[in-house]
């Protein structure tokens, strides 16, 4: 398929509440009307899908209701937020962008964003 350049930050640190946000930007070679954005997680050479959303250019990104991802789009830029992360979810998160319509189909893969998640220390018991 036709390749497309996708850029994303190298490293992101999740908040203490387990939320990580990053921007995924793609160089659209044409005037796409329908775009699909997928977040993949690569760990131990295994690649799994974290979430995916298809949107019409100019409209909002809509992930499934039970998705851990949310996002907004602006031009060729997608702002992605992943929630509910724990230390065990630390890993490389890859942004995949597909230009679905009109043909031809284009696909771009970012180099990945290493998301570090640190579980918060439990609050110490207090004697009151």
């Amino acid at each position: 398929c036709k390749a497309m350049h996708v850029a994303q930050p190298a490293v992101v640190l999740a908040s203490s509440r387990g939320i990580a946000s990053f921007v995924c930007e793609y160089a659209s070679p044409g005037k796409a009307t329908e775009v699909r954005v997928t977040v993949l997680r690569q760990a131990d050479s295994q690649v799994t899908e974290v979430c995916a959303a298809t949107y019409m250019m100019g409209n909002e990104l809509t992930f499934l209701d039970d998705s851990i991802c949310t996002g907004t789009s602006s031009g060729n830029q997608v702002n992605l937020t992943i929630q509910g992360l724990r230390a065990m979810d630390t890993g490389l998160y890859i942004c995949k962008v597909e230009l679905m319509y009109p043909p031809p189909y284009y696909l771009g893969i970012g180099n990945g964003t290493q998301i570090y998640v640190i579980d918060p220390e439990p609050c110490p018991d207090s004697d009151f």
Partner: antibody, heavy 124, light 108 residues
């Protein structure tokens, strides 16, 4: 064994409809993109349509767009082609064909497994 | 759309001969080309993808070469079971997927 078996072909009058099915077995159907390719009698191969492994995307040849609909039921390991407003020029053997799909690189866009085909004849 | 032109449309050769079929794209397609074999009354079978990579189980007498616009399928030593029609297919800019018109190979 690994195979694709088409069914549903037959003789139909111009303007009428027909639905083709393709039953897959011996492999994980839900991991593959699927295509329909046709071959008119004595002629070459013509790509008709494709559907993504999960049904999330579909494309059609200009010659059938708006008349044909490709769909799949992964729970039944079956691919379908709904053909409406059939024309004489749609007469052909219709093959379903498998297309590898990689989560990182997408469809491969070539066909590593073909069914035996089903003949559709559009004639009054 | 990119057009694929195969030549010759048919050929006749003797058993043991080296047979060459060419496929030309109207625009550059890098190495995004596949070759199929269709024996009389049978289903097409993938021979080669990525212009030169042999599909598993395909005899080594088949080979593919080329990049850009000009591609070649070669049968180094023609066998009786190679009687078939051979099709090229481009897949660099999909859809649509486009096949060549086919080359019919017969034995003299």
């Amino acid at each position: 064994q690994v195979q694709l078996v088409e069914s549903g072909g037959g003789v139909v009058q111009p303007g009428r409809s027909l639905r083709l099915s393709c039953a897959a077995s011996g492999f994980t159907f839900s991991s593959y993109g699927m295509h329909w390719v046709r071959q008119a009698p004595g002629k070459g191969l013509e790509w008709v349509a494709v559907i993504w492994y999960d049904g999330s995307n579909k494309y059609y040849a200009d010659s059938v767009r708006g008349r044909f609909t490709i769909s799949r039921d992964n729970s039944k390991n079956t691919l379908y082609l709904q053909m409406n407003s059939l024309r004489a020029e749609d007469t052909a053997v219709y093959y379903c064909a498998r297309d590898r799909y990689d989560i990182l690189t997408g469809p491969y866009w070539y066909f590593d497994l073909w069914g035996r085909g089903t003949l559709v004849t559009v004639s009054s | 759309d990119i057009q694929m032109t195969q030549s010759p449309s048919s050929l006749s050769a003797s058993v043991g001969d080296r047979v060459t079929i060419t496929c030309r794209a109207s625009q550059g397609i890098s190495n995004y080309l596949a070759w199929y074999q269709q024996k009389p009354g049978k289903v097409p079978k993938l021979l080669i993808y990525a212009a030169s990579t042999l599909q598993s189980g395909v005899p080594s007498r088949f080979s593919g070469s080329g990049s850009g616009t000009d591609f070649t399928l070669t049968i180094s030593s023609l066998q009786p079971e190679d009687v078939a029609t051979y099709y090229c297919q481009k897949y660099n800019s999909a859809p649509p997927l486009t096949f060549g018109g086919g080359t019919k190979v017969e034995i003299k």
